[in-house]
Amino acid sequence: NSYYDKVLAHSRIRGRDQGPNVCALQQILGTKKKYFSSCKNWYQGAICGKKTTVLYECCPGYMRMEGMKGCPAVMPIDHVYGTLGIVGATTTQHYSDVSKLREEIEGKGSYTYFAPSNEAWENLDSDIRRGLENNVNVELLNALHSHMVNKRMLTKDLKHGMVIPSMYNNLGLFINHYPNGVVTVNCARVIHGNQIATNGVVHVIDRVLTQIGTSIQDFLEAEDDLSSFRAAAITSDLLESLGRDGHFTLFAPTNEAFEKLPRGVLERIMGDKVASEALMKYHILNTLQCSEAITGGAVFETMEGNTIEIGCEGDSISINGIKMVNKKDIVTKNGVIHLIDEVLIPDSAKQVIELAGKQQTTFTDLVAQLGLASSLKPDGEYTLLAPVNNAFSDDTLSMDQRLLKLILQNHILKVKVGLSDLYNGQILETIGGKQLRVFVYRTAICIENSCMVRGSKQGRNGAIHIFREIIQPAEKSLHDKLRQDKRFSIFLSLLEAADLKDLLTQPGDWTLFAPTNDAFKGMTSEERELLIGDKNALQNIILYHLTPGVYIGKGFEPGVTNILKTTQGSKIYLKGVNETLLVNELKSKESDIMTTNGVIHVVDKLLYPADIPVGNDQLLELLNKLIKYIQIKFVRGSTFKEIPMTVYRPAMTKIQIEGDPDFRLIKEGETVTEVIHGEPVIKKYTKIIDGVPVEITEKQTREERIITGPEIKYTRISTGGGETGETLQKFLQKEVSKVTKFIEGGDGHLFEDEEIKRLLQGDTPAKKIPANKRVQGPRRRSREGRSQ
C-alpha cells in the first residue's frame, strides 16, 4: 500500500463510528485546509502546530443516502469529464468544456486528470487567469493538457521522485509521495485522489499548475533579489550544479537576508572557500521538499552534510525553529525553491566561538573579555570545553581576573578534538599547558570532574563540547588530598599502618571511598590496636574502599546500580540518585574530588564486603559497632586472605639503571647475564571509534631479554611509570614493535544504541564494529618488547 492509501485507511478507521465508508479529516482552524487524518495528527489534534477540528466526510468514491447512516452508496462512475462534476471540480469542468477538451475526455482513451479545485482557480493570479480565458482554444487548452497524463495513474502508481510527461509538450509533472500520505504534483497537493472514471482517473489538486521550463540556475540568474546568493554560488562553484538534472530543494536567501548578516561574518565566510561552499550547500537538499508536505517538524540532510529542521506554523514554514520562508514552492524543472529572509549558517562555516549557544554565553563573554578570543585564530584549530552558564558561581565571576583567565585556559584545547575522537584514558593539553584526563562511561563522557551534556558541535576552526561544571584539573595525589583534610586523619593512619600509603601516592587510576573520622566514632585506642594488629584484616577492609579505575559520580547513569570490583576483590555497589552518589546504598557526603591519580568519594561510614566472614569475636564486635548498614557474617576460625599487592602496581615497568652500561665487544668468558622475566600486561581502555565506544584490550607480553655488559653494576626493576630517559632508550637499542589491538565488541560496558544516539546527539551515524576485528596500531617504541 502507498503512504496515501495507508493514511486514507487510518482516516477510514477513525471515521467508522459514523457509519460505513466515512473518513475522518482534520481541518486546520481558520483555514480551508483539510487533511486525511494520520495517526500522529489524530493524537496531536494539530497540524503544523495549529489546532484542528475533525470533519467526517464520505471517503473518496462513496456517497450518502437519504435517511441512512454513513456513506453506504458508491459514487456513480462516469467518464473523466463527468467525474470532474462528481468531485466538485466544476470550474475545471467548465474550462474543459469551453476549451474543446471535453470531447477528448468524454471519448476513448485513458487519462489521469490533476484537476484544480474551484478554490485553486480563485487563488490563481487574476492576470494569468484572464489570459487563459481570453485564449481558450490555445492557452487554456495547453494549460489543461499540462494537468493531464495519457494513462490512468492511481495514487499507488504515483511514486516519489517520478517525473511523468504531461499531455502538453511532454512537460514533466514532478510527483512526490511523502511518508505522511501527502501526494504532490509540481508541489500542488492531491486533496481528493483516485476518483475512478470509465476512461481514467481524476485527482483533485489544491492549485493550478504553472508551466515549468526553467532550472534553479535559470531562476537565480533572472532574479535580481537573489543576486547575492547567485554571486555566492558562483564564488563557491555551485551555480552550474543547480542547472543540472535532479530533485533539489533550494532555500534561497534574498539580498535582504544577506544584509542581516553582520558584515564581518560575511566577509570572513566569503574569503574562505571551504566555509563559503559549506554555507551554500547548507541551503540545498538533494530531495524535493514541497511546502504542502510539511505537516510537522522533520529533519533533512543538506548537501553540506549537516541537517536542518523544517517545520511549519500554520501557513508559515520554519527552518531550525525560525519562521523565515517568505515565498514557497517556486517549482523548476530540477527542483523547488523557497525564498527565505535569513541566511542559514552551518556549524562548519562558523568560528569555534560562534558555536556556543544561549546556555554558554557566560563562558564566551568571559573568553572575549579576558582577551582569549583573539588567540583563537581563524586558521588555527581549537576545542572549547564550555561550561553551561549556571556552572559559573558568583564567587567564580568575582575572582581576580588573572585567576579567572587561568581557569578559562583550562577549557581551551590546543587542537580540534571531536566527540568521536575522545576515548577513555586520553590526555588533552590545554592552551595553558595543563593536562586533562578523559573518562568514558556507558552514558557519559567526562573530562576531569565535569561531564558533558548534549550539544557538541564542530566548526571551521574547532569543536565545542558542553560541560555541566567548571573543569578543575587535579593538582594533588590521593594521599596528599587525604593528608591535607583533617576529616580523614584516622583513615590515613590506618592506611599507613596497613603499608598502603605508596598505593595512593604513585601514578595510577583509582576510585577511593574515603571514610571520614565520623566513620570511626566510638572506636577506642585498644580497638584501633586490635584492627592494626591483624594486617590482613586491615588491608582487606581498606582495600574494599579502593577500586581500580576512575569512576566519577556524575558519569553514572541515574538510578541504575553499577557493580564494581574493589581492589580487595569483593563487589561494591554504586548508584547515582538525585545528584547524590549512593555507595552500598549509603549516601556519599561529597563526591568527585579529583586527584592526579584518581577520584575520592567521601563516606561517613566504614564500608565492609558483605561476602567476607569474620572469625574473631573481638573484631566482629568492633566492626558491628562501626558498620550498621549490613549484617556481618561470623564464621569461627576464618581468617582474612592476604592480598598480593604486586597485582595492583602500575602496569608500566620502569627500569632504572644505576651506573651507565658500557657497551663494547664482549670477549669470551666476560659476559654478565641477567634475565628479566616479563609478565603479560593487559591494558584495557575505551576508545570511541566511528562514534561507538569500544573497549580495547591490549595484551603486551614482555619477552625475556638478555642484557650483557661487564660494567653493569645492577639493574633494579621498580614499579611506577616515570620517565626512563635516554639511558633506557640506549639500553633497549631502539627496539620497535607493532601493537595489535583486539577490539572486543558487544560487551556490557558498551553503550546501547539509544544511548549512543543520546550521547552523540546525532553527530555521525554510528558504525558497529564486528567483534574481534583486528585493528593494526601504529608502529611504536615499546618498553615491553614485541607485543602479541
Partner: antibody
Framework: QVQLVQSGAEVKKPGASVKVSCKAS????????ISWVRQAPGQGLEWMGW????????NYAQKLQGRVTMTTDTSTSTAYMELRSLRSDDTAVYYC???????????WGQGTLVTVSS | QSVLTQSSSASGTPGQTVTVSCSGS????????VNWYQQLPGTAPKLLIY???QRPSGVPDRFSGSKSGTSASLAISGLQSADEADYYC???????????FGSGTKVTVL
C-alpha cells in the same frame, strides 16, 4: 545597464553640512545596499558607511559616527549622504557605490567633489 | 594612515607580469577576504577582484588575485598601457568594524 549618477560639486564652509545624492538606475534599487567612499586629494580611499535600500539599516565607519547620516528614497531610487560639522580635512571626492555585500562596490558613481574652505 | 600596506609603485613593460602586494594583520586580511579595485586616472574606482580570487564579469583573466595568511597579491599578466592606474586592496577589519583600504599602488607601464 546599471548607473549611479551623483549630484554636482559643492563648496562649503567649515562647520556647515553637505548632502550628496546618488540616483540609481538599471537595477532593482531595493535589492542592493549603497556604500559611500571618499577620497581626499592625492590620497587613498576611505569607506564611510553603508545603507540598505531595502529597509534603511545603516552601518557607519566608527570615525564618522555622529557626523554622517545616510538615507534612501525608494520612490526615486536615490541614496543620500549628509555630512555635518564639516572640517577642512573633509575636502574630498565622495563616491557612492552599489554594495550587495557578497560582491562589494561593484558599480560606482562618478564622484562628487566637496570642498571645505573658509 | 591606511591600515593595509601596499608598495607605493610598481612598473613593467608591455606583456610583462606585474605583482602588487598588500599586507595586513590577523584582524583584517588574516580573518577576512580581500577585494581589489582599479582606479584609472581621473575616474571612479572599479571592482577588479572580489573574495580573494573572483573576477566580476567583464574583467579580463589577465587579472588574478590570491591571499595567504595576512597578505594578498594582485597579478597583472600581459601588461597593457590601459592597465596604468592606481590599484587598491581592501578588506573588512574586525577590530575596527570598518571596511579598510590599502594606501594604493601606482602601476606604470614603461
Amino acid at each position: 545597464q546599471v548607473q549611479l549618477v551623483q549630484s554636482g560639486a559643492e563648496v562649503k564652509k567649515p562647520g556647515a553640512s553637505v548632502k550628496v545624492s546618488c540616483k540609481a538606475s538599471g537595477y532593482t534599487f531595493t535589492s542592493y545596499g549603497i556604500s559611500w567612499v571618499r577620497q581626499a586629494p592625492g590620497q587613498g580611499l576611505e569607506w564611510m558607511g553603508w545603507i540598505s535600500a531595502y529597509n534603511g539599516n545603516t552601518n557607519y565607519a566608527q570615525k564618522l559616527q555622529g557626523r554622517v547620516t545616510m538615507t534612501t528614497d525608494t520612490s526615486t531610487s536615490t541614496a543620500y549622504m549628509e555630512l555635518r560639522s564639516l572640517r577642512s580635512d573633509d575636502t574630498a571626492v565622495y563616491y557612492c557605490a552599489r554594495d550587495m555585500l557578497v560582491v562589494p562596490f561593484d558599480y560606482w558613481g562618478q564622484g562628487t567633489l566637496v570642498t571645505v574652505s573658509s | 594612515q591606511s591600515v593595509l600596506t601596499q608598495s607605493s609603485s610598481a612598473s613593467g613593460t608591455p606583456g610583462q607580469t606585474v605583482t602588487v602586494s598588500c599586507s595586513g594583520s590577523s584582524s583584517d586580511i588574516g580573518s577576512n577576504r580581500v577585494n581589489w579595485y582599479q582606479q584609472l586616472p581621473g575616474t571612479a574606482p572599479k571592482l577588479l577582484i572580489y573574495s580573494n580570487d573572483q573576477r566580476p564579469s567583464g574583467v579580463p583573466d589577465r587579472f588574478s588575485g590570491s591571499k595567504s595568511g595576512t597578505s594578498a597579491s594582485l597579478a597583472i599578466s600581459g601588461l597593457q598601457s590601459a592597465d596604468e592606474a592606481d590599484y587598491y586592496c581592501a578588506a573588512w577589519d574586525d577590530s575596527l568594524s570598518t571596511y579598510v583600504f590599502g594606501s594604493g599602488t601606482k602601476v606604470t607601464v614603461l
